[in-house]
């Protein structure tokens, strides 16, 4: 008789999840010599251990501590780029501006980027059929708890000027319910972080509004100021030109406003 399986509302574990995690770990350690000491088999074992045989609505940050320990990494604390709802452009930026880092440029963020995973209570199986949805099922699911854990640690590590890229095409440019709004903002350390600088990325080519005056940006400014961190904001009117100018800063057209 087939055993009853919980049907969750979200997509199941990414196909070939173990293969992808291991391959990404190996690749990351080959690209980043300072992480060459990392044993990718141990990393996978710790990753697996965080959610296998556990109820996928009952995952805690504590479950991920062995993985966090193995993935400990020092990134320059003054070169951190946070993002919200504009991941691709943030990644394109750090691929050009090699001295800046998003969370997904760190080992643990790189391993999990775009992946979904969950297990089942009391069995060693990975659930490839469905996983809990944050809204419809539960917030303490393996994926959400992972990102909350690594995002908190990443924000806590930041210092000096921290940059955040925000999507100016969204109705809520700053969303209190995003990972940035609910985790990272509240874990920046005022004794280390001097300024949070927001880059608001415009979507439309003819959009010349000052989106730094948007009510949600004012809300972000208020939250940050109350935490004794300075706030500044820049409009990025032409993201394509912005990237081009990061690549070729000496280009004559890069002196004008982007």
């Amino acid at each position: 008789v087939p055993r009853w399986r919980q049907q969750w509302s979200g997509p199941g574990t990414t196909k070939r999840f173990p293969e992808t995690v291991l391959a990404r770990c190996v690749k990351y350690t080959e690209i980043h010599p300072e992480m060459r000491h990392v044993d990718c088999q141990s990393v996978w074992d710790a990753f697996k251990g965080a959610f296998i045989s556990k109820h996928p609505c009952n995952i805690t940050e504590e479950d991920y501590q062995p993985l966090m320990k193995l993935g400990t990494q020092t990134v320059p604390c003054n070169k951190i780029l946070l993002w919200s709802r504009i991941k691709d452009l943030a990644h394109q930026f750090t691929q050009v501006q090699r001295d800046m880092f998003t969370l997904e440029d760190t080992l643990l963020g790189y391993l999990a980027d775009d992946l979904t995973w969950c297990g089942e209570f009391n069995t060693s199986k990975i659930n490839y059929q469905s996983c809990p949805d944050w809204r419809k099922d539960c917030s303490n699911n393996p994926v959400s708890v992972f990102w909350k854990t690594v995002s908190r640690r990443f924000a806590e590590a930041a210092c000096d000027v921290v940059h955040v890229m925000l999507n100016g095409s969204r109705s809520k440019i700053f969303d209190k319910n995003s990972t940035f709004g609910s985790v990272e903002v509240h874990n920046l350390q005022p004794e280390k972080v001097q300024t949070l600088e927001a880059w608001v990325i415009h979507g439309g080519r003819e959009d010349s509004r000052d989106l730094c005056q948007d009510p949600t940006i004012k809300e972000l400014e208020s939250i940050i100021s109350k935490r004794n961190i300075q706030f500044s904001c820049k409009n990025i009117y032409r993201p394509d030109k912005f990237l081009q100018c990061v690549k070729n800063p000496e280009d004559s057209s890069c002196t004008s406003e982007i």
Partner: antibody, heavy 117, light 107 residues
């Protein structure tokens, strides 16, 4: 310099077995992910299998899972592909390749496997 | 598995021409993409890794660009020895998948 040399190809009947070898030299064999990639006549490239450096993790394409086994002998610097229950659609040139930084940076010259009755 | 779609499937160009081959992924793959050149009867050869990094020993007329879903291999001044089939490969999500290839012929 890095060299990969495959051997063991040939003509085999459907349902039979064959073992391919890939002799590696010029690098520390046990420090890299080693892969098999194949190419059917006149067709494109298809990934077949990988074994990670310590040999504890082996993964396969769906098309060969349960029939093919990848293995490595670090003392001989040699990669193997044991192919059982061969089918006509397994006819291809089989390449071994080293993976570094997510790319196949070195390839062998290939060995042709023909499955025909 | 992630699908990689190359275009065109074949092209013919003259020596000295600028040739562009594109590869589109069925989902975002950051910059986890390589380009390979294969001549008839030979093994493939790595040209570009991480979307835009030139493999050592590869002529500088080859360049790669792109991120996310759209990638380009450019040969800035086509040479007779560049007659070959070119493949893209993603390794963002396992297993690695190749594009179907672009055959480049010299006019």
């Amino acid at each position: 310099q890095v060299q990969l040399v495959e051997s063991g190809g040939g003509v085999v009947q459907p349902g039979r077995s064959l073992r391919l070898s890939c002799a590696a030299s010029g690098f520390t064999f046990s420090s890299y992910g080693m892969h098999w990639v194949r190419q059917a006549p006149g067709k494109g490239l298809e990934w077949v299998a990988v074994i990670w450096y310590d040999g504890s993790n082996k993964y396969y394409a769906d098309s060969v899972k349960g029939r093919f086994t990848i293995s490595g002998d670090n003392s001989k610097n040699t990669l193997y592909l044991q192919m059982n229950s061969l089918r006509a659609e397994d006819t291809a040139v089989y390449y071994c390749a080293r993976m570094f930084r997510g790319a196949f940076d070195y390839w062998g010259q290939g060995t042709l496997v023909t499955v025909s009755s | 598995a992630i699908q990689m779609t190359q275009s065109p499937s074949s092209l013919s160009a003259s020596v000295g021409d600028r040739v562009t081959i594109t590869c589109r992924a069925s989902q975002g793959i950051r910059n986890d993409l390589g380009w390979y050149q294969q001549k008839p009867g030979k093994a493939p050869k790595l040209l570009i890794y991480a979307a835009s990094s030139l493999q050592s020993g590869v002529p500088s007329r080859f360049s790669g660009s792109g991120s996310g879903t759209d990638f380009t291999l450019t040969i800035s001044g086509l040479q007779p020895e560049d007659s070959a089939t070119y493949y893209c490969l993603q390794d963002y999500i396992y297993y690695p998948t190749f594009g179907q290839g672009t055959k480049v012929e010299i006019k």
